[in-house]
Structures are given as C-alpha cells and as structure tokens.
Amino acid sequence: SEVEYRAEVGQNAYLPCFYTPAAPGNLVPVCWGKGACPVFECGNVVLRTDERDVNYWTSRYWLNGDFRKGDVSLTIENVTLADSGIYCCRIQIPGIMNDEKFNLKLVIKPAKVTPAPTRQRDFTAAFPRMLTTRGHGPAETQTLGSLPDINLTQISTLANELRDSRLANDLRDSGATIRIG
C-alpha cells in the first residue's frame, strides 16, 4: 500500500516529505526512521530535526531541501541494496498524538550496465512541492486539535497518503498535498 520510490545502487535516493510552517522560523520537529512508522515517536532514527535545526543525523542521510521552509525530504547518499525497505517520516505536531506520519517504500535496483551515461531523473519535476488535484476529488483532509503556536496549513507527502485510491493511482510518483484545517 506504499507508493514505491526507486533508485539504483550507487545513486542517491530521494524520499519526499513536506509540511508548511506558519513562519520560516517556526519549525516542527521531524524524525526519519528506517522501518514503518511505530505507534509513538520514530524507531531506528536516521535523522531528526528540532524547532531550530537538524539535531541528529547518521552517515549518508541528509536533508537536501530547505527544511526551514518545511522541505524535510530525505536524501540517502550512494545507496546499496540494503537500503531497500520502508522509511517513516514523522512530523511531530504539538499536542498529544497530533503527529502526521507517512510510510515511504524505497526499492533499490541493481545498477544498469549501460554503454553511455544517461541523464539522471529530474526530481523537481517528478516531485512537485504543491499539487492541485483534479478529477476524483480533493486530497485527504484531516482536522487536528487547536495548534495555537504552529497553525500549520498543509503537509505534503506521497500519493498513497490520499484517501481516494483512484486518485493515488493517477498521482503515482508524484508528491501530494494534505490540507490541515
């Protein structure tokens, strides 16, 4: 039920996860873990941010985007077959269990032996920050408890986080938007 994100051995892998802070400095803690999301927190943490900065990271895992603007997409450098599996992006919204959590499946393929170099995929096109949905209906709407300090407006993530599975199929390999009222 997870959308698959693919990379070849030796390449960098990209796992998209976004939210929109109320203000650039008003950040929400985020953790990335190897393995599907636990009930509480993140297990097997590979990277963590707090309200100000990245406060924990491990070799080969980094945030390439501007996390201060809510781009907490994970880049895994120089992947191997062992990097395959499910990863959890958990956006730790204040309040008891208000967290948004997303399971992303990474599939690593053996490197192709090709006679000529091929152009790498344009991830900017493949994973747009915002996505206006059409056809089957809106992205999933989730109502959270009052968030006086954060007032998040939207969290963006992968297509399988949509309630409408038909829409998810249409948006496979695209980012998707979840709006929080």
Partner: antibody, heavy 117, light 107 residues
Amino acid sequence: QVQLVESGGGLVQPGGSLRLSCTASGFTFSSYAMSWVRQAPGKGLEWVSAIGGSGGSTYYADSVKGRFTISRDNSKNTLYLQMNSLRAEDTAVYYCVKDGAGGFDYWGQGTLVTVSS
Amino acid sequence: DIVMTQSSSSLSASVGDRVTITCRASQGIINHLGWYQHKPGKAPNRLIYAASSLQSGVPSRFSGSGSGTEFTLTISSLQPEDFATYYCLRHNSYPPTFGQGTKVEIK
C-alpha cells in the same frame, strides 16, 4: 532475540497499589518507545500507557489517567507501571510491548493483576 | 476517537478453508494498521504491519490488504495452529485502539 519479561502482578484490594516491571533484552532499549497493553477476563486488548525512548514523553488511556504512572530506567533496560487507586475493572493480564517498526512488534507473556476484596 | 470494528466477533471454519477477517475504521487511517494473533495464555503475535507487510517469521498463508477505512486479513489455507483470536490495531492517532477481536473456531 527480543525478550520482554513482566513481573509484579498479583492480588490487591480495591484502592490499593501495585508496581509492574518489564525487563527487556535483545534490542537497544533506549531507542524505542514502550507500552503497556492489558486484557481483562473475557474482553479484548486495550492499550493502557506508553513512554518515549528517552522517557521524556508519556501517554495514557483516559481510563487510567491520574492513577497510573509509566516510567523506564534505560540503564537497567526496565519498564515500569505504577498503578494506584486500583479498581475491580483494572483486573487484567498486563502485557509489556515494544513499539517497533509498524507498531507493537514484540510482546511479553503478561502478568496477571487481580483487584478484589 | 476513531472506532475500529471487526466484521464478526467469531467465525467457524475448517482446516484448509480460506478465511477473511475485515476491520473497518470510522475515519481514514491511511495504512497505519496491524493484525495480531492471540492464543489463550500466550503473548499476542504480530502477523501484519503497515496494512499489508508480513511480519518476519510469519507463514505466507497470512496476508493483509486495504487502506483508508477498510482492511482485510486473509488466511489462504487455515491450519490447526491458526485457531485463535485475531485483532486489528490502528495507530495513526491518539489513542491507539484495537478492534474487538474475531475468534476463529473449529467448525
């Protein structure tokens, strides 16, 4: 191999107190949140309480809030549940549970708590 | 709170039967759902996590499917050791809640 061993259950009178312990092995205890889940006789499973890996965050079911306190000692790989003001409806088998990838992945065998006069 | 409702509290089946247990959520929970097998006097055993991922060491006759509000646990060919009570657990938000359980009994 992950192992969770509960202890401390027993018979207690209504209004009394009991402290459950759970000793963990086979994984990096401090890296994972832990929970207590219970099953009353003839009933289903009910989540009771949880604590984050560092011990800084705690969570409780409404039915036990204000009466039960969860804690952990990462240096001893041990999880605790202090149960006060016990009621007959707290009678159950209490399971210690590891919160791993995808949810509650490993469970102990359980310890029976009986609240009766 | 989100309520989890399992299709039936008990069902009777024979060895070799294909058994399907359904769990419905009162609101969408994406894929934050697990399935557990529980036998009297034993620790519950996780079969499926993230709605469809098979727990390591669990026989392949068990499978999970679904997303959003409706989830299914399927036992493709029921074995004698599979007679037990099965629970779904959702954990997308606080508090994590179990379904009421489905007891699979010998017909």
